[in-house]
Amino acid sequence: PSPPPEKKELRKVAHLTGKSNSRSMPLEWEDTYGIVLLSGVKYKKGGLVINETGLYFVYSKVYFRGQSCNNLPLSHKVYMRNSKYPQDLVMMEGKMMSYCTTGQMWARSSYLGAVFNLTSADHLYVNVSELSLVNFEESQTFFGLYKL
Amino acid sequence: PSPPPEKKELRKVAHLTGKSNSRSMPLEWEDTYGIVLLSGVKYKKGGLVINETGLYFVYSKVYFRGQSCNNLPLSHKVYMRNSKYPQDLVMMEGKMMSYCTTGQMWARSSYLGAVFNLTSADHLYVNVSELSLVNFEESQTFFGLYKL
Amino acid sequence: PSPPPEKKELRKVAHLTGKSNSRSMPLEWEDTYGIVLLSGVKYKKGGLVINETGLYFVYSKVYFRGQSCNNLPLSHKVYMRNSKYPQDLVMMEGKMMSYCTTGQMWARSSYLGAVFNLTSADHLYVNVSELSLVNFEESQTFFGLYKL
């Protein structure tokens, strides 16, 4: 007899886009409308919750812009939280200082992406230093991952 | 009897590099020579044509440079076109303003990468705002994807 | 009789982080402690050594910063070396010029990532133009790959 048909497992993947009603850290994300993906991973209060241990490629882009450049330091972090550990773990980070000409309208992006070994119940978040300078267009600011 | 040997499916993947004879939008790409990859995906008039629905990681980098900075706004977009939809969909975008010191020689890159659910017959393209400021070296300006 | 249980092959993956005792090129990497991954790939004198031919997504981020900007040109390269070829092949490269205000404290990142067809015994390295301007925090400067 032929072997039973292979059960095609759903790919664990997420692509969340900017949500302009973020008021504090971590950033909140659009998880329903537009070019969003969420499969085999949960979204909870700004975080992607891993439900299967394994290797994941995690990425994020944040689009910063302003009208009168003051060169406030910008930071963009992807970090991990797990109830087993007392402290957040910064997985990836980008920083910018002295990036525009004083007083000018300016715009700049930060991109992060890398592979991590994640454990079931890990919560992943994105943090930025200057929330008021983030533009949340879905094509410009996003956060995602997929299981290798 | 043992099951038939598994037919290893060709990975759907593309990595195209800058082509300096691009004269208008969308950008055109080198699809034959150098460190180019094109397998299970077609290249047509600047676009990558999807022939199998599924999840894809899509990425692009563009290298902008100039002899005398005048801070023209720069944009770098990856967008999708499908005959079923009336309008292009911007999947990812990077913008830069006030990024160099007036009059100086300057150079800057924009990188984009994320996961999308693509449908057979989707065409993916890259657009930039200032074609004359793009350098097309194969290591500096590229466009690619792979099916997860 | 049922077919033998599938032998789950170990995923070929690496994520190496910045090592501040890099003294010359190529950059050296932390391959043991922290959020490091190294499986099915070898690390040797700054390089990731491929032991199985195939398609790989390769990425790197470098975090440059300085106390007093003088706009030294910055470059960040991922290149490949193989004893069969006389010359290094630059796979990906980022360059920056005129990126900060003279005399100011500054910080900037360069990110690279793309798919390549690599061959067993290929050695992959990262090179930067100004080693003294690199910050080696594990979340800020890294180098990795995974087999598709």
Partner: antibody
Amino acid sequence: QVQLVQSGAEVKKPGASVKVSCKASGYTFTDYTIHWVRQAPGQGLEWMGVISTYQGDASYNQKFKGRVTMTVDTSTSTVYMELSSLRSEDTAVYYCARFPDWDYAMDYWGQGTLVTVSS
Amino acid sequence: EIVMTQSPATLSVSPGERATLSCKASQSVDYDGDSYMNWYQQKPGQPPRLLIYAASNLESGIPARFSGSGSGTEFTLTISSLQSEDFAVYYCQQSRELPYTFGQGTKLEIK
């Protein structure tokens, strides 16, 4: 509440310099650039330049290049605008105004400082 | 630099009536879906006061009788029903690029 308080009126001779101060309170000083705008008697508004309160460097209107210097003292949340080689046509009210980087316009202004240049 | 031209120089209107002030820019002040045009009101002996930002957005605390419109190079400030406290000088200003530039002003006076 947000306040920008400028120094008092000045009378200067042609060729001299004047230094006007603008002290900020009621908000996080280093989060906003400070712009300087002047207004000659019975005339319109003229933008002079802007200073980064965080970084301390400035961008100036080309018209005043070489004559205007803007500085910042973060310890006292004060910005200074110095104009040198004064001439009679520099007689004006000088205003400082803050500009939120995330917004579109100068939202709070100082009360103005009248500088009179006369021999 | 971008030159801003306001018209008319003086506008005489009766209280309760509608006032329409115009501002033209020598080049577009639009970028990325926004118009970088602001309107200020100035009364004698006082600093300018922000009324409208980004062409059509009412600054907090400004009465709803003030409205702005336009894009590209042509902009309008409208006061729907003039109150006695509205008689002042009005300036348009572009914040699209440095140097910021102002119009020469429109004086709104009681008819």
